[in-house]
């Protein structure tokens, strides 16, 4: 603790100019004071002034009023500082002395004589209020007041509480009268060292190092740190949690970088071809007759559509073609015959019927044969009747479609939902794809059916095939294989033309 006992001398009266021994001062009592402050004693005794002592210069002669003086010699009130916890009790001895010597340093003069002394014993609380008193004896009267106040930065009933106002890294506060801290605006905490963040700043996602600030933790953004940041590789997606990549409408793939509406956005197919949003590049062009190429940009030979009938040979010309007909045929496409039924033109048991008064004929073919002369065996699979990759097989007069897994129906046109039987374990999400069901596994599980629990760095073993990139950190304990074009599967192990970069999670 630290404080100051202050004594204000107000008036001293010694009308007769007498000393304590009854003698008179000549020419008058040139008066100075000695003050001794010590711990409380029921009976005041000589001995050290344990709380401090002080002397004044000569303040006047015989009777005088003592003016307040704040500096230099003769300072009033008198200051008795102490460096301990104020006990609340004290003993005070005030002695008035006459000196024949130096006004300013009368203590040092020989021949000083006691005029009078007073002793005060009692209790005194720390406070700003002065306690006023007056002591009389037969010859003198002393008016005075006193108090105990705390030194700068000390507070409390005993001046034992240290508080120094500050505004720096260690705290931002002022001191209350009792020494408790009063935080400056924008600061809080026991030592006022915690800033009060911007109102509404998210408690978990945000923090601050100074008032009214809101600094976001990794993965969060915005004024209040309540908006997430999408994954670093994300292209056309958003997030609801940090580092997610939820695709915008019309985009797909692990990083939302595949245009699901490529046909609409880019019109890649030329020469009147049909564009569909599928295939390894995100689109496929179906060309009109006479065109080829990835974008149907290449014109085919005019003969490519085999326009010449009845065995005629085709020759390309600048903007057209020419059919060279075999013997017995004529016309632009060798479609007219010079033969008649007499020439037995119908093969494979076909029946000949004369037309145009016998100048031409038509063949009626038996089952399984076709062509103008019944020369072709019917291939019932030429029209590609089997959908969804089914295999067409000729069976005598009919044909059947052998369907791929997941499809049924006469033409394999019906899709069987493999997900109906819930093949994915541990809460995996099932996707019906051409090759059968595929499971997207939750965090911590892998395998084609999410049956394997992961307990290690999933990418460490290099699980992805065919040049696929392995990712961890998208969700705990899982890896994701981002497949190159032309490969699918949880590890990109299957070379199948499924939609690219489906997020296969192992």
């Amino acid at each position: 603790g630290s404080g100051i006992f202050q004594l204000r001398l107000q008036e001293f009266v010694n009308q007769r100019g007498m000393l304590a021994n009854g003698q008179s001062c000549e020419p008058g009592c040139r008066t100075f004071f000695r003050i001794c402050l010590k711990h409380f004693q029921a009976t005041f005794s000589e001995g050290p002034c344990t709380f401090g002592n002080v002397s004044t210069p000569v303040l006047g002669t015989n009777s005088f009023v003592v003016r307040d003086k704040n500096s230099g010699s003769g300072r009033n009130p008198l200051q008795l500082p102490f460096n301990f916890t104020w006990p609340g009790t004290f003993s005070l001895n005030i002695q008035a002395w006459h000196t024949p010597g130096d006004d300013l340093r009368p203590e040092t003069s020989p021949g000083n004589s006691l005029i009078s002394q007073i002793i005060i014993q009692g209790s005194l609380a720390v406070g700003k209020i002065w306690r006023t008193d007056e002591q009389n004896d037969t010859l003198t009267r002393l008016s005075y007041s006193y108090r105990v106040i705390c030194s700068d930065n000390y507070y409390g009933e005993s001046c034992s509480r240290l508080c120094k106002k500050r505004d720096d890294h260690f705290g931002h506060y002022e001191c209350q009268p009792d020494g408790s801290l009063s935080c400056l605006p924008g600061w809080t905490g026991k030592y006022c060292d915690q800033p009060i963040c911007l109102s509404g700043c998210h408690e978990q996602n945000g923090y601050c190092s100074k008032p009214d600030e809101c600094i976001c933790r990794p993965g969060w953004q915005g004024r209040l740190c309540n908006e997430c940041i999408p994954h670093n590789g994300c292209r056309h997606g958003t997030c609801s949690i940090p580092w997610q990549c939820a695709c915008d409408e019309g985009w797909g793939g692990l990083f939302c970088d595949q245009d699901l509406n490529y046909c609409t956005h880019h019109s890649p197919c030329k020469n009147g071809s049909t564009c569909s949003n599928s295939g390894p590049k995100g689109y496929t062009c179906t060309c009109l007759p006479g065109y080829t190429g990835e974008h149907c940009e290449l014109g085919l030979s005019k003969c490519a559509s085999n326009p010449c009938r009845n065995g005629g040979s085709c020759k390309d010309q600048e903007n057209s073609y020419h059919c060279l007909c075999p013997p017995g045929y004529y016309g632009q496409h060798c479609e007219h015959s010079t033969l008649t039924c007499a020439d037995s033109p119908c093969f494979n048991g076909g029946s000949c019927r004369e037309r145009n008064q016998g100048s031409s004929y038509a063949c009626e073919c038996p089952p399984n044969f076709t062509g103008s002369n019944c020369e072709k065996k019917v291939d019932r699979c030429t029209s590609n009747p089997c959908a969804n990759g089914g295999q067409c097989q000729n069976r005598g007069p009919s044909r059947t479609c052998r369907c791929r897994p997941g499809f049924t129906g006469t033409h394999c046109e019906l899709h069987i939902s493999d997900c109906a039987r819930s093949p994915c374990a541990h809460g995996g999400t099932c996707h019906d794809l051409e090759n059968g069901p595929v499971c997207t596994c939750p965090a911590g599980f892998s395998g084609r059916r999410c049956e394997v629990r992961i307990t290690h760095d999933a990418c460490a073993s290099g699980p992805c095939f065919n040049g696929a990139t392995c990712y961890t950190g998208l969700s705990p304990n899982n890896f994701v294989c981002n497949c190159p074009y032309g490969f699918v599967g949880s590890r990109c192990e299957f070379p199948v033309g499924l939609p690219p970069s489906f997020p296969w999670v192992a």
Epitope: P218, G219, Q221, G222, I229, P230, C234, R235, G473
Partner: antibody, heavy 118, light 107 residues
Framework: EVQLVESGGGLVQPGGSLRLSCAAS????????MAWVRQAPGKGLEWVAT????????YYRDSVKGRFTISRDNAKNSLYLQMNSLRAEDTAVYYC???????????WGQGTLVTVSS | DIQMTQSPSSLSASVGDRVTITCRAS??????LAWYQQKPGKAPKLLIF???NLADGVPSRFSGSGSGTDFTLTISSLQPEDFATYYC?????????FGQGTKLEIK
Amino acid sequence: EVQLVESGGGLVQPGGSLRLSCAASGFTFSNFPMAWVRQAPGKGLEWVATISSSDGTTYYRDSVKGRFTISRDNAKNSLYLQMNSLRAEDTAVYYCARGYYNSPFAYWGQGTLVTVSS
Amino acid sequence: DIQMTQSPSSLSASVGDRVTITCRASEDIYSNLAWYQQKPGKAPKLLIFDTNNLADGVPSRFSGSGSGTDFTLTISSLQPEDFATYYCQQYNNYPPTFGQGTKLEIK
């Protein structure tokens, strides 16, 4: 393909102003926070400013606060840096980058040189 | 601000060598660290984020490790195109700060 193309750099006197632009393509610009990062000749990289995608909140390094302003126009897929009261120590190649102050800078532009000299 | 210190500031190596670059943070940044590669006259390119995650299209010969204050970038078998300057960056604390760079030169 993600592309960031800066423009607007050049020679300017101390105390002068310059406005840098960054044209973004290949990603949904409005979904992502953006930043400016600079590199003084022969020196390392230094983050300058960031703007959020959600509400346009801005942050600046202390040495440019009050002098530089980062802004964005989502309709034009563009990021801007208005630089006022330029100083010699602002001389650098300024890169437009996709990222925030608390995330990696995933994509960068080719940079534009700003020279502050009398 | 967090100080990021890279070492060495430069190093010479040959094609096929295994190379390690270290980065030390002045305080804990957890795993919020990225590595960038920069070639002369070009923009930096993100190699690794979150200490050990490879950015899209980055060859698997690059790897990262560490946590807290000490981190490493390793190139398992140097290729001719790997000679460049490498920077680490922390994004755990505001403001983000970069290391001073490590120049990888051909021996």
